[in-house]
């Protein structure tokens, strides 16, 4: 007998063909021999089965000897062996209906787990294989679990259910609620304006919640709140801001913060936390601020950086258009009795300059 796989909620067409291409008597019955539909004269008649209000046939194809049965809004319990009786012969079609659903909301926070549950008819032994938008393959039986969702898991998941060498494909849209970046670092010269941006990796029609930027300055013994805010329908309103530094926040998304000037005492790292309506848990983005200062005091030219820098970063002082250079994998470099001219302080990572500050050394007569 022929096996057909269907998807819960979908429509399936079970085909039945007569040898002669003409309109003739036919009946569709279930395994209990209860009539579902058939032809009487030129009219489609329906029997007392549970399917009667969801079953139909393509009348336009009858005179071609095609007597299909269409079942709409499939249910798992529609799984059965259906019999088509035409021209004194019986054709059996086994219909197996499967459903694949996410156990929770399909809008999930980064780090939360996703569980997909397969609904299947009794006696079936299907296998499920899912592919994430990022190309991750996961296999399972009745349930498939993704323990920790990542931002790249956002998008359409394609799941294939296999049974008796037949397959049916499900597409499930998953939205991972996260910031676009887990972490970002801003490099600034002392005194420059600092812009922090926290773009979201998703879009929601209605976005409501609240948040805070909690900051640990490198020079401070304890961390503190820099700003707290509310988000109502994508509109941002500041709740409380620390007096030093006096941060400013944009009124629209993406979340945007401005620090009037980069100072050594602000260098450090922060954590922006966002709690969203109807979500358990919070979104986080780490942000780092690195501040550079170049100074000349008496016979000493110094360049310093504050904030979270990796040990492999190089700090250099070099005289423009001259070979004189001092470099260190440290947070401060200095030159005693520097030559007159324009000196450059450079913070670089494997040759790529992250931050530079110029200081003019005037000749001492």
């Amino acid at each position: 007998k022929k096996v057909v796989l269907g998807k819960k909620g979908d429509t399936v067409e079970l085909t039945c063909n007569a040898s002669q291409k003409k309109n003739t008597q036919f009946h569709w019955k279930n395994s209990n021999q209860i009539k579902i539909l058939g032809i009487q004269g030129l009219f489609l008649t329906k029997g007392p089965s549970k399917l009667s209000d969801r079953a139909d046939s393509r009348k336009s194809l009858w005179d071609q000897g095609c007597f299909s049965m269409i079942i709409k809004n499939l249910k798992i319990e529609d799984s059965d062996t259906y019999i088509c009786e035409v021209e004194n012969k019986k054709e059996e079609v086994e219909l197996l209906v499967f459903g694949l659903t996410a156990n929770s909301d399909t809008h999930l926070l980064e780090g939360q787990s996703l569980t997909l549950t397969l609904e299947s008819p009794p006696g079936s032994s299907p296998s499920v294989k899912c592919r994430s938008p990022g190309g991750k393959n996961i296999q399972g039986g009745r349930t498939i679990s993704v323990p920790q969702l990542e931002r790249q898991d956002s998008g359409t998941w394609t799941c294939t259910v296999s049974q008796d060498q037949k397959t049916v494909e499900f597409k499930i849209d998953i939205v991972v609620l996260a910031f676009q970046k887990a972490s970002s670092t801003v490099y600034k010269k002392e005194g420059e304006q600092v812009e922090f941006s926290f773009p979201l990796a998703f879009t929601l029609e209605k976005l409501t919640g609240s948040g805070e930027l909690w900051w640990q300055a490198e020079r401070a013994s304890s961390s503190k709140s820099w700003i707290t805010f509310d988000l109502k329908n994508k509109e941002v309103s500041v709740k409380r801001v620390t007096q030093d530094p006096k941060l400013q926040m944009g009124k629209k998304l993406p979340l945007h913060l401005t620090l009037p000037q980069a100072l050594p005492q602000y260098a450090g790292s922060g954590n922006l936390t966002l709690a969203l309506e109807a979500k358990t848990g919070k979104l986080h983005q780490e942000v780092n601020l690195v501040v550079m200062r170049a100074t000349q005091f008496q016979e000493n030219l110094t360049c310093e950086v504050w904030g979270p820098t990796s040990p492999k970063l190089t700090l250099s002082l070099k005289l423009e258009n001259k070979g004189a250079t001092v470099s260190k994998q440290a947070k401060a470099v200095w030159v005693l009795n520097p030559e007159a001219g324009m000196w450059q302080c450079l913070l670089s990572d494997s040759g790529q300059v992250l931050l530079e500050s110029n200081i003019k050394v005037v000749p001492t007569w």
Partner: antibody, heavy 119, light 107 residues
Amino acid sequence: EVQLVESGGGLVQPGGSLRLSCAASGFTFSSYWMSWVRQAPGKGLEWVANINQDGGEKYYVDSVKGRFTISRDNAKNSLYLQMNSLRAEDTAVYYCVREGGQWLALDYWGQGTLVTVSS
Amino acid sequence: DIQMTQSPSSVSASVGDRVTITCRASQGISSWLTWYQQKPGKAPKFLIYAASSLQSGVPSRFSGSGFGTDFTLTISSLQPEDFATYYCQQANSFPWTFGQGTKVEIK
């Protein structure tokens, strides 16, 4: 270690005045909002007032508005609550509290000082 | 003013029990909710901020949930040191207000 020590509580007659003080140590006092929270005997907690870092912003619960004044002296690392026109219903343990927790939480509390308003 | 209503007002439980306390705000307060624990004769201790985030040093048997108007504090397996009074507090708008408290007593 963060420490908040209240003083100035005692017995006062209805209509009288009292000034509570709170000595703060173990943190940069001038960087934090501070609050007063009270608790009547055998009852729950009631937030009374708070003040921002430089004293420019102050908020009060309606029942004490016009009678109580919150203030601070950052040079002395001290918080104050001036209580005038005291009533029997002001009888409570008064806690000095730092608003230093994440999401505006009240993270450090003093041991409290008892104010009894009775004739 | 925003009214905070806690239920139940008291609960009798045994060591190892799961205890759930609810807190309802008279209007939406987003996630501006903090939970405190108070033992007799002592100052309150800060447990949970932002409705569901555990303060550093607080045992993981404590958890919080909720957003808007309905919030929950759960102690998954009650320990002897957890018998105390628990308060919720909103920091959404002034005046800040506390729930009336829930006393967790030994059965």
